[in-house]
Interface confidence: low
């Protein structure tokens, strides 16, 4: 349905404040490096505009698309040829080219800072100030930082952190109140970011047939009492509300998926009885609890798939006449079966039935060709299970962080040209999995193992994209999502990489060690792991933990010694010769 | 919610014919193929025909082909069976499905289909 004014109807059924909101995300997930009070001034600018709009939706501009208001709005910033370079030329422009530039230049990894936590106190007072520009600020700077973070989600997450200082600024104890919450906050929003990153590298480098087949998966085990039209129908609308996002188009997404999470509550009943709790509360709280609802019951008496998908003599009748969508209800019966399979699992075996038909099919006999196709699944499902087995192993003999140090080894042998902070990051990350899915009964290890590893490596995959050092990054990010995880747990050690140069000031230590939290030191302690691994690529698990365990002894002397300073100065290069010897 | 009416069944002469039409709605119809699928009493599904979504396709069973013909208006979200020359071995529930799946998809009741003398 066409309206006279875009910006008009957008503001209308969204109200003021989650509009105002949603338009600061978009401006400073575009222009990351403006300062707020530009930002807000811009947006101050364009909701006066959308209120005259309201007013006459045939008032001078109003007929004008949001991508063309928004652009022509950012275009007018002074200083955006010095703060943002080539940037600036998306200003010459014409949409909807001009669009597609400023998205080309998002930036996953921007030069920020990071965010400093004030004191409580300062924090509480700043709210009770200005609690309006408090929460603006909040949105603005996790918006930079995170320029693919799912908008409407983020304005869940601002009223959280809102609700938050309402209570704790209240409370006897403000930090014990507060400092939990914001942890739990920072944490999730990361976590957030990081899967919505994914959702928008599906659709922007492999296309919405592949977001579909994703989420046509991830539905049919979330309902399996759905019908395929049901599941279906769910996949188009909230295919277009991840299109719409990642896109930048944010009143539109935010604006659909209100809708999306209205019909779902209208048609519980054929969609999973685990909605009723979502559907009582308000719209950013129903939304956000709809997208984690827990997989509903399957159904008891669902019939074997062999009947419809192998025995069956229409197969290939059945697939010659619509492929996609018999390989959506193949994967929609599949799926529905098998909560205790990682999404990619499920993808990959769709994608091998295909494979297999698409050969049969051809075949002199189809069916003797393809009667055993579901053998050829019991590698593909094995794979992950075993390696979520040994490695749920590993990290419950090692904890997390020697967990931690045992992935960094073994994703710099495989691709030691990655720079060493991304190593870091990722390896972390990756560490994580462990504390998040080894304690999960075993059938929801793997959905929660893989799919998080997914996740985490697409992560790399962004980073690496943006400054690209390694063929084999490059091959294993860009040839089959499905197959990211599979790829790089299958590299070895990188015969062909050229050891680095040993440089004794990247383990040059200093008495500001000793005051750094566990989790800065960990990553210090983590970064000398990764330098060291590039340096000698050969070591083994013996060589690099002895080296490792020295350093540790030797940063826990110096911090206890009077003169800090000095002991580091002394103990330093000691520790350096030692370590070259052991690596000899 | 997914909805699929199927109506236009009813006793009829062997020999004669009937055109049965299914309504959907609750889903995009257009995106998808369509199946008419019946069920005899004491028999499994069997599916007699089936449209690709822009119904440039069709597929029929040997027992019905050049007797039935499917066909679709994306327009009025309707599936149609054109059936002639109907024997007493057509008597059966007829559904229409999503896809080409014999399982009914939705709460479609089926429309029954008699043929008698």
């Known amino acids: 349905d066409t309206h006279k004014s875009e910006v008009a109807h957008r503001f209308k059924d969204l109200g003021e404040e989650h509009f105002k909101g949603l338009v600061l995300v978009a401006f400073s997930q575009y222009l990351q490096q403006c300062p707020f009070e530009e930002h807000v001034k811009l947006v101050n600018e364009v909701t006066e505009f959308a209120k005259t709009c309201v007013a006459d939706e045939s008032a001078e501009n109003c007929d004008k698309s949001l991508h063309t208001l928004f652009g022509d709005k950012l275009c007018t910033v002074a200083t955006l040829r010095e703060t943002y370079g080539e940037m600036a030329d998306c200003c010459a422009k014409q949409e909807p080219e001009r669009n597609e530039c400023f998205l080309q230049h998002k930036d996953d990894n921007p030069n920020l800072p990071p965010l400093v936590r004030p004191e409580v106190d300062v924090m509480c007072t700043a709210f009770h100030d200005n609690e309006a520009t408090f929460l603006k600020k909040y949105l603005y700077e996790v918006a930079r930082r995170h320029p693919y973070f799912y908008a409407p989600e983020l304005l869940f997450f601002a009223a959280r952190y809102k609700a938050a200082f309402a209570e704790c600024c209240q409370a006897a104890d403000k930090a014990a109140c507060l400092l939990p919450k914001l942890d739990e906050l920072r944490d999730e929003g990361k976590a957030s970011s990081a899967k919505q990153r994914l959702k928008c590298a599906s659709l922007q480098k492999f296309g919405d047939r592949a977001f579909k087949a994703w989420a046509v998966a991830r539905l049919s085990q979330k309902f399996p009492k759905a019908e395929f039209a049901e599941v279906s129908k769910l996949v188009t609308d909230l295919t277009k509300v991840h299109t719409e996002c990642c896109h930048g188009d944010l009143l539109e997404c935010a604006d659909d998926r209100a809708d999306l999470a209205k019909y779902m509550c209208e048609n519980q009943d054929s969609i999973s009885s685990k909605l009723k709790e979502c559907c009582d509360k308000p719209l950013l709280e129903k939304s956000h609890c709809l997208a984690e609802v827990e997989n509903d019951e399957m159904p008891a008496d669902l019939p074997s798939l062999a009947a419809d998908y192998v025995e069956s003599k229409d197969v290939c009748k059945n697939y010659a006449e619509a492929k996609d969508v018999f390989l959506g209800m193949f994967l929609y019966e599949y799926a529905r079966r098998h909560p205790d399979y990682s999404v990619m699992l499920l993808l990959r075996l769709a994608k091998a039935y295909e494979a297999t038909l698409e050969k049969c099919c051809a075949a002199a006999d189809p069916h003797e060709c393809y009667a055993k196709v579901f053998d050829e699944f019991q590698p593909l499902v094995e794979e992950p299970q075993n390696l979520v087995k040994q490695n749920c192993e590993l990290f419950e003999q090692l904890g997390e962080y020697k967990f931690q140090n045992a992935l960094l080894v073994r994703y710099t042998k495989k691709v030691p040209q990655v720079s060493t902070p991304t190593l870091v990051e990722v390896s972390r990350n990756l560490g994580k999995v462990g504390a998040k899915c080894c304690k999960l009964p075993e059938a929801k290890r793997m959905p929660c193992a893989e799919d998080y590893l997914s996740v985490v490596l697409n992560r790399l995959c962004v980073l690496h994209e943006k400054t690209p050092v390694s063929e084999k990054v490059t091959k294993c990010c860009t040839e089959s999502l499905v197959n990211r995880r599979p790829c790089f747990s299958a590299l070895e050690l990188d015969e062909a990489y050229v050891p680095k140069a040993f440089n004794a000031e990247t383990f040059t230590f200093h008495a500001d060690m000793c005051t750094l939290s566990e989790k800065e030191k960990q990553v210090k302690k983590q970064t000398a792991l990764v330098e060291l691994v590039k340096h000698k690529p050969k070591a083994t698990k013996e060589q690099l933990k002895g080296v490792m365990d020295n350093f540790a002894a030797f940063v826990e002397k110096c911090c206890k010694a009077d003169d800090k300073e000095a002991c580091f100065a002394e103990e330093g290069p000691k520790f350096v010769a030692a370590s070259q010897a052991a690596l000899a | 919610q997914v909805q699929l009416v199927e109506s236009g069944g009813g006793l009829v002469q062997p020999g004669g014919s009937l055109r049965l039409s299914c309504a959907a709605s609750?889903?995009?119809?257009?995106?998808?193929?369509m199946s008419w699928v019946r069920q005899a009493p004491a028999k499994g599904p069997e599916r007699v025909s089936a449209i690709s979504s822009d119904g440039s396709g069709t597929i029929y069973a040997d027992s019905v082909k050049g007797r039935f013909t499917i066909s679709r208006d994306n327009a009025k979200n309707t599936l149609y069976l054109q059936m002639n020359s109907l024997k007493p071995e057509d008597t059966a529930v007829y559904y229409c499905t999503i896809g080409s799946s014999t399982t009914p998809s939705g709460p479609g009741q089926g429309t029954q289909v008699t043929v008698s003398s």
């Open positions: 609750g889903f995009t119809f257009g995106q998808f193929g």
